[in-house]
């Protein structure tokens, strides 16, 4: 029977007695920055080229004995997980290894930087097909390492990294914290976060997704036919590097943004037990376990979106938090969240020629998060329409008035500290779904987009009694682009998208009376692109 980890990432239609998905990543080259490797292991022989790059620190300790099999252990195993003949994910992918970790698994930022530069130069000298760079390492936060990753990513290289094994916020580590890198946490055979001794997988908003990372069978550097089980986020990252190689081999023109969106889209959703994570990290950590797409083609018709959380704003009165989409993505909506419920909303604003999502803390608040909904929408022309606070008691309204523009998201932002505490809810007039409605004291922002074949609709779910969470989901074939709460519900902590579901969170119901103040309405904007659907039918 196939190893559990390969079965886990394999869609049911591939599952026979063996793991044999079509096209094993043969058009893709994967660079591995790790320890030295045993390239003549039968699992990887002829698949991995050992480059002459080596930049490692001296081993610690006077009694350290260099033993080849120990020096090669980590890298050999990972090379096997990515492209091993027997227990590899992308059995057709070729690899190149660079040694940046010593026999104790230690490296330096400078060694990794020089390794990345080596790859960039190799790419310029001899351009090949799509490149994936696997960085199965984690150190303290490094602005310079993150910047180097950003440069390489912007040159068209896909970087995949380990989230780190410190049972901590991945944003405190590099390269895990680099937004351009695909950061991978580790789960086990029960789809639970991996525990490693007293520590375990990192988590948080800097993790893009999880992948199998416990008891992973792979090539052992002990001997040419030896196999061993290893665990950690390095193994998880190797799975995603393999999946990326498979996807890029099937669709070599995929951009980094498209690849990341597909990795997220095809992941298993909501299978991880979030109780393992610290309470304050649960909402920020993606509940996604990587998997291969069920078919190598035909995903192009879908409108792909993902949720990007900002860093925490901090508690100061005027503190703000900013969430940004990747360069190739469109910001289709913006929401905010505060655990204390004290916030002054959010707004979409231009920054460096691109829209960003900014959330505002309120006096006495413990801080806010901005939540961006980032989507792939080719040929899109999006703009933000703002209505200042209204004079009328009916509240503030704004709609998309330009011909062919559709509403993809609503945001509201206010200056007063305790907006709506004693105000009844404002009801949306029937038959006017293409507009954003808010408190009269708030300025309302509508995200309006024009793209070929784009259509959107508003879905609401209201609960009259107080409840900690109200959700509304888009149906099959539609993608959630906007998520907000209908105004008037003062105890709302915020709104955010989880996959295709809009979640509106409220304060602990025990502190809220069951008056009309308790009513909570979640508003989802669901979109689809008929143009993308037609384009994919033509391609096939």
């Amino acid at each position: 029977s196939i190893p559990w980890n390969l079965e886990r990432i394999t869609p049911p239609r591939y599952r026979a007695d063996e793991y044999q998905p079509p096209d094993g990543g043969s058009l893709v080259e994967v660079y591995l920055l790790d320890t030295s490797i045993q390239s003549d292991h039968r699992e990887i022989e002829g698949r991995v080229m050992v480059t002459d790059f080596e930049n490692v620190p001296e081993e610690d300790g006077t009694r350290f004995h260099r033993q080849a099999s120990k020096c090669d252990s980590h890298g050999t195993h990972l090379a096997g997980v990515v492209s091993g003949r027997d227990a590899g994910v992308a059995k057709g992918a070729s690899m190149r290894s660079l040694r940046v970790l010593n026999c104790q698994g230690k490296g330096t930022v400078s060694g990794t930087l020089i390794g990345l530069e080596f790859i960039r130069k190799s790419q310029l000298v001899q351009p090949v097909g799509p490149l994936v760079v696997l960085l199965p390492l984690a150190g303290g936060y490094s602005r310079v390492l993150n910047a180097a990753c950003q440069r390489l990513a912007r040159a068209g290289v896909v970087l995949v990294t380990a989230a780190g094994n410190f049972r901590d916020d991945a944003c405190l580590y590099s390269p895990a914290s680099a937004p351009e890198v695909i950061t991978v946490g580790a789960t086990n055979a029960q789809d639970q976060p991996v525990t490693l001794g007293t520590l375990g997988t990192n988590f948080g908003r800097c993790v893009d997704l999880f992948a199998p990372g416990e008891d992973i069978i792979g090539a052992s550097s002990d001997c040419s036919t030896c196999f061993v089980s290893q665990s950690g986020t390095s193994q998880a990252a190797a799975h995603v590097a393999g999946i990326a190689a498979m996807m890029l081999s099937a669709e070599p023109e995929l951009t980094l943004a498209e690849l990341r969106q597909r990795l997220i889209h095809f992941s298993a959703k909501d299978v991880i037990n979030e109780a393992w994570f610290p309470e304050d990290q649960r909402v920020l950590t993606p509940n996604l376990v990587a998997a291969l797409p069920p078919s190598t083609h035909g995903a192009g018709w879908q409108l792909f979106c993902r949720t990007v959380w900002s860093a925490h704003s901090g508690p100061t009165r005027m503190a703000t938090a900013v969430a940004r989409c990747a360069p190739d993505e469109e910001l289709l909506s913006c929401s905010s969240f505060s655990r204390s419920g004290k916030r002054r909303g959010e707004r979409m604003e231009a920054q460096g020629g691109k829209l960003v999502c900014r959330a505002h803390n309120a006096f006495g608040g413990e801080g806010v998060y901005a939540i961006a909904r980032c989507c792939l929408l080719p040929q899109a022309n999006c703009s933000v329409h703002t209505a200042p606070p209204a004079e009328a008691s009916m509240g503030t309204r704004v709609h998309c008035h330009q011909q062919g523009h559709v509403l993809t998201g609503c945001s509201s932002h206010w200056e007063v500290e305790d907006l709506g505490t004693h105000k009844p809810p404002v009801l949306r007039p029937r038959g006017q779904p293409n507009q954003c409605v808010g408190h009269r004291e708030a300025s309302i922002h509508a995200s309006c987009c024009h793209a070929p074949g784009l259509e959107c609709k508003v879905k609401e779910h209201g609960i009259p009694a107080p409840q900690e969470q109200v959700t509304v989901a888009c149906e099959e074939g539609w993608t959630l682009t906007g998520c907000s709460a209908l105004p008037g519900t003062s105890h709302v902590l915020g709104a955010y998208a989880v996959d295709n579901t809009c979640v509106v969170r409220s304060r602990d119901v025990s502190t809220t009376g069951s008056t009309s103040e308790g009513a909570v309405t979640a508003v989802a904007i669901c979109c689809r692109s008929r143009h993308l659907a037609q384009a994919s039918q033509e391609l096939q």
């Epitope: 003549d40 059995k91 036919t225």
Partner: antibody, heavy 119, light 113 residues
């Protein structure tokens, strides 16, 4: 049941070429390695090399490198051993055997192909 | 290359008696990653292909009578036939399968005394 069936005995002259075969059945051919083993008359077993039918990658024993070619056609679950120019010293019984990454010993053997090279 | 040396070259044992064959490897075939010895024993009867008896130095292949047992670790190994039967007349080979080239012992011929 799982079996490896080899082609029949061959009698050849020195300098001639030859390709013998080993057909796998009853299992997933591309999941297992196929090795070739030589046994000269009255002698012991000598490992010649392996092929992985999944990607047709081969690894030869230094003693046999350049002397023989191992190949496979996964569409018909068959591995081959060939010579471009036979020598009298190639006279031997040749066995194919399979092994797996999780079971790297030879659990199934072919019945053998006797190759006789004589002028 | 790992050299495998068997002793004795031939062995004559009475029916029902114990037969012991030794095998020594020029380097250890025990590996810490899984704590296994990468050593197998094969039986070859005249006119037949070899047949797997023992793998991982001491695990009996299914269908092999329990009078066959393997022991040893590292570099020194033993195949024991606890009570020799007429059908056990054959040549026995040890083999290491941890590194390439794969190597066999020269063989031990077991006969009935």
């Amino acid at each position: 049941q799982v079996q490896l069936v080899q082609s029949g005995a061959e009698v050849k002259k020195p300098g001639e070429s030859l390709k013998i075969s080993c057909k796998g059945s009853g299992y997933s051919f591309t999941d297992y390695y196929i090795s070739w083993v030589r046994q000269m008359p009255g002698k012991g077993l000598e490992w010649m090399g392996w092929i992985y039918p999944g990607d047709s990658y081969t690894h030869y024993s230094p003693s046999f490198q350049g002397q023989v070619t191992i190949s496979a056609d996964k569409s018909i679950s068959t591995a081959y051993l060939q010579w471009s120019s036979l020598k009298a010293s190639d006279t031997a019984m040749y066995y194919c055997a399979r092994d797996h990454w999780s079971k790297p010993y030879f659990d199934v053997w072919g019945q053998g192909t006797l190759v006789t090279v004589s002028s | 290359d790992i050299v495998m040396t068997q002793s004795p070259d031939s062995l004559a044992v009475s029916l029902g008696e114990r037969a012991t064959i030794n095998c020594r490897s020029s380097q250890s075939v025990l590996y810490s990653s899984n704590n296994k010895n990468y050593l197998a024993w094969y039986q070859q009867k005249p006119g037949q292909p070899p047949k797997l008896l023992i793998y991982w130095a001491s695990t009996r292949e299914s269908g092999v009578p329990d009078r066959f047992s393997g022991s040893g670790s590292g570099t020194d190994f033993t195949l024991t036939i606890s009570s020799l039967q007429a059908e056990d007349v054959a040549v026995y080979y040890c083999q290491q399968y941890s590194s390439f080239p794969i190597t066999f012992g020269q063989g031990t011929k077991v006969e009935i005394k």
